[in-house]
């Protein structure tokens, strides 16, 4: 199944000697290294782990290993001037004041450079004003506050929970109701799994820590100064008035004690409803303004943080093809952390890192992978995915006609419950025969397939026997490969059993108890779980750049195309008097994914007779499969997201971590019943299933038989 | 072993000054909010104030405040109350005492020093 | 802000069970703290949040606080439980620390 012309291994045994090279004892070894200070993007510190980086991926036996500079805007906490949170009485003194830094943790008291807990590109401002509580931010509740309990939010300081969606959707919501300021905060419902002990002792949350993270609505468009072009020597720079995806309100993360301070004390409306609780002991009382004896406090924001056009560094290395050098598979994953990064991302580049000693040992031994292989070691991806768009915006023209796929490699683990994939569709069959031919690391399953136990603790909600694998959604580094340049893409990495949470994150997500010992001790004391992902992102990797036919399966596109269409439809007829009045009709979308359907399985057989001795025909077939992807962009965009231009897939407008499905016509029915213009919005719905099902029949033809 | 050490009371005048310290070992002391607790002679507890484990908060009780200052330097793992303007009801045992919960806000005092001695009289 | 009345003395034989109140103002809705202390030695927590015991404390320690009254519990009474035993709230409205009074445990 894998072979290559160029190579001194027994070809069957390429891919058993790859994997057999990866030890999880260096996992181990590179995650410690990686984690003992803090890599935070711009710094000095990251600078010299991209240098550490370059330079063993040179001794590991790498072709070449290259530095990719730009200079981006980023965002920074003033040093001499904290930013906090506090409350004033009628005086205007501060009474109480929230955290300027998180406790730090046994043996890194005396680490220098731990940026404190602060939302990256807040603006500067010291509002003040009575406090909302907004539940998780989301459109939902914002929805649930201003049309059902009539509350408006214009010119208050908001307070909402951290989880659900992604922190700059909560933002954005924020401004659209008018807010002056957003408090961030991780609530124990959300950040303290039960009968699990607080760091230190355990992986739960303390009360002192605190999420950071970006609040850019950047849709895509990487660093907010140079849109759609690398922000290189020679850039063109917008005005800070003009930078796209900047939040126009303070925001500022706090943790939970804190929070009781705040919201302890909260009156007004009582929480519309239980999902409105968390788990202080306090009323969740939604406001506006403190209670009875405390109405005449207000909530104060100091915030200073400065906004930097800085030096940042990719690492690049390559190990060129034997057979088919002009063609890409990338391993790419983050380097730059809040902190430490023991999860995020150091869990992830570790994995890499034994990933490519693994490959250099066979290429010094002399095997070379058919097609070429690019490691990229990616910088402020905390920022807003920065490094790798950027790199991506430089080498677009090439990416977009050499880009076979790319395997996002951010934190390897989450959990160590079992197995969690995002791909494209092309790829499920590849995951599927990888891992049933891998070992599963979880107990109980001894002697079973990775692909056993992930099938039994993650099911498919549509196939018996079949594990799921979710929608690419966006908040990693794949985003500009796969949403805007229409590269196959997929992640993988171990999980926690906590579906209802799926995007809060664990605990500890980008606090500074993201430590080398939290994984230690806590998660994955053996590595199991991290060799296991290491297989997985590597065995990828390793068919994609290797096998003569590219091991990509167009039926599995066809399936889900059909589920979205029906799911997409189903939204639709909830409006059927509108559907009818205004002439909507799916039959161009039903009949482009059904003729997709079929093109898609002539080619599947053709796939399987064709004359695989024939270069040229091996080549043209390969291309079909490389270009299918592609074919699902539209060069226009989506309407408002000119970077997000898959027409199948886009990150969901209410929450960045999560993939939608059909978006152009989702959006455009969103919420139709409350806009002002029926007749325009139901105009653009025709003119999104247009778009999608011209796409969709696009796509089939690029299957087709070429001549 | 965790132990706190007070340092600096004695016989003083009052409207006089003196500068307490509390030196502390065997845990990671700024991670914990510290306090001041007194107890005058053949009287209860009488908590003075706490300063929060980064500085963010100072509080005090209100017989002590505008009189007394709460600092900690986190480097050399010391708390210190600079008091002035003392009076003779200051007159105390001065304990030094922990917060129960690392990083929390206060709520009780798990660890106490031995105490110093603090006479203010004429 | 609040105030914590607590009996001045309770005595009590060996072997039988103590018990101190500590009354006041909205105790029941703040964790109550229960601190030993012997002459001339610094206090000692041996309750927290009501009802938590510290490692090192015996088992005949226990806390309890409903209403508006919390109450220390020492079972099997020795003679080493004489001492001064206080009980404490945060005032988290004020920001304040606050101590009863003290009650003298009086072994017989």
């Known amino acids: 199944k894998s072979s290559n012309e160029a190579t001194n291994i027994t070809p069957k045994h390429n891919m058993k000697a790859f994997l057999d090279e990866l030890k999880a004892e260096n996992i181990k070894k590179f995650l410690y290294n990686f984690t003992q200070i803090p890599h935070l993007a711009g710094t000095e510190q990251n600078f010299q782990l991209a240098k550490q980086i370059q330079s063993q991926w040179k001794e590991f036996g790498l072709d070449s290993v290259e530095l990719a500079h730009y200079d981006v805007l980023l965002s920074y906490p003033n040093k001499t001037h904290p930013n906090y949170i506090s409350i004033i009485n009628e005086d205007g003194n501060e009474i109480f004041n929230t955290s300027l830094f998180e406790p730090p943790p046994p043996g890194y008291e005396n680490v220098s450079d731990i940026v404190p807990p602060f939302s990256a590109f807040s603006p500067q401002g010291m509002p003040e004003g009575d406090l909302v509580y907004v539940n998780y931010a989301r459109t939902e509740d914002f929805f649930k506050l201003e049309r059902d309990m009539k509350i408006n939010c214009s010119g208050k300081i908001v307070i909402a929970r951290y989880g659900k969606v992604f922190r700059g959707n909560k933002v954005k919501n924020a401004q659209l109701a008018g807010a002056k300021g957003v408090i961030l905060y991780s609530d124990p419902a959300d950040y303290f799994a039960p009968g699990v002990k607080s760091y230190p002792d355990g992986w739960n949350l303390p009360g002192g820590g605190v999420q950071r993270g970006n609040i850019l609505n950047l849709n895509g468009a990487g660093d907010p100064l140079t849109p759609g072009y690398p922000a290189n020597e020679y850039a063109y720079r917008r005005g800070i008035a003009e930078a796209v995806g900047l939040p126009s309100i303070p925001v500022h993360p706090i943790g939970y004690y804190d929070a009781q301070k705040l919201l302890e004390k909260m009156g007004g409306s009582a929480p519309p409803d239980s999902s409105w609780r968390g788990s202080l002991k306090v009323p969740y009382n939604v406001g506006p303004g403190f209670t009875g004896n405390f109405s005449t406090q207000k909530v104060k924001m100091h915030i200073h943080s400065t906004n930097e056009v800085t030096r940042i560094y990719n690492v690049i290395g390559t190990l060129r093809g034997a057979v088919e050098p002009d063609r890409y598979v990338i391993l790419g994953g983050h380097r730059d952390s809040w902190v430490f990064g023991g999860i995020d991302p150091q869990s992830g580049a570790a994995v890499v890192h034994e990933i490519v000693r693994s490959f250099g040992t066979l290429k010094k031994e002399g095997w070379r992978p058919r097609r070429t292989i690019l490691f990229a070691s990616w910088d402020a991806e905390e920022f807003g995915l920065l490094g790798s768009t950027e790199w991506a915006e430089e080498n677009s023209r090439l990416l977009q006609e050499r880009g076979v796929a790319y395997i996002n490699a951010d934190s390897s683990i989450e959990g160590n419950y079992t197995l969690r994939v995002d791909c494209t569709p092309l790829m499920y069959s590849l995951v599927h025969n990888l891992t049933k031919e891998l070992k599963s690391p979880d107990e109980g399953f001894e002697g079973k397939s990775l692909y056993e136990s992930w099938t039994k603790k993650s099911p498919s909600p549509e196939f018996s026997g079949m594990p799921r694998i979710s929608k690419l959604g966006s908040g990693n580094d794949f985003e500009v490969f796969f949403q805007r340049l229409g590269i196959a893409s997929g992640r993988a990495r171990y999980t926690k059993n906590w579906e209802t949470n799926k995007f809060s994150g664990y605990p500890l997500y980008h606090s500074v108890y993201e430590t080398y010992e939290l994984v230690e001790k806590f998660y994955d004391p053996m590595f199991k779980y991290h060799l296991t992902v290491a297989q997985v992102r590597g065995g990828m990797v390793f068919e994609l750049a290797n096998s003569i036919v590219l091991p990509f399966d167009c039926r599995d596109y066809a399936v889900v195309l059909r589920k979205y269409a029906d799911k997409i439809y189903s939204i639709s007829m909830k409006h059927p008097q509108e559907m009818k009045t205004y002439s909507v009709s799916f039959d161009s979308l039903f009949s482009a994914v059904k003729n997709f359907t079929e093109i898609a399985s002539k080619f599947s057989e053709r796939l399987q007779d064709f004359d695989k001795s024939n270069p040229i025909v091996l080549r043209m077939m390969n291309d079909q499969l490389m270009f299918l992807e592609r074919a699902f962009i539209d060069p226009l965009g989506l309407p408002d997201r000119p970077f997000y231009r898959h027409v199948i897939y886009a990150p969901s407008s209410h929450n960045k971590y999560a993939g939608e499905s059909f978006p152009g016509i989702y959006d455009a029915l969103f919420d139709i019943e409350s806009k002002v213009d029926p007749s325009k919005a139901w105009g653009e719905v025709k003119r999104q299933i247009y778009v999608a099902a011209f796409t969709v029949q696009a796509a089939a033809e690029t299957l087709s038989e070429v001549a | 072993q965790v132990q706190l050490v007070e340092s600096g009371g004695g016989e003083v005048q009052p409207g006089r000054s003196l500068r307490l310290s509390c030196a502390a070992s065997?845990?990671?002391?700024?991670?914990?909010?510290m306090h001041w607790v007194r107890q005058a002679p053949g009287k209860g507890l009488e908590w003075v104030a706490v300063?929060?484990?980064?500085?963010?908060?100072?509080f005090y009780v209100d017989s002590v405040r505008g009189r007394f200052s709460i600092s900690r330097d986190n480097s050399k793992n010391t708390l210190y109350l600079q008091m002035n303007s003392l009076r003779p009801e200051d007159t105390a045992v001065y304990y030094c005492?922990?917060?129960?919960?690392?990083?929390?806000?206060?709520?009780?005092?798990?660890?106490w020093g031995q105490g110093t001695v603090v006479t203010v009289s004429s | 802000q609040s105030v914590l009345t607590q009996p001045p003395s309770v005595s009590v034989a060996p072997g039988q069970t103590a018990r101190i109140t500590c009354g006041g103002n909205n105790s029941g809705s703040k964790s109550v703290h229960w601190y030993q202390q012997k002459p001339g030695q610094a206090p000692v927590l041996v309750v927290y949040?009501?009802?938590d015991r510290p490692s090192g404390i015996p088992e005949r320690f226990s806390g309890s606080n409903s209403g508006n009254t919390a109450t220390l519990t020492i079972s099997r009474v020795e003679a080493g439980d004489e001492a001064d035993y206080y009980c404490q709230v945060w005032d988290s409205s004020s920001d304040h620390g606050v101590f009863g009074g003290g009650t003298k445990l009086t072994v017989l």
């Open positions: 005492a922990r917060d129960t919960v690392w990083g929390s806000h206060p709520d009780a005092f798990d660890i």
């Open positions: 949040d009501d009802s």
């Open positions: 300063m929060s484990y980064d500085g963010s908060n100072r």
């Open positions: 065997g845990f990671s002391f700024s991670g914990y909010g």
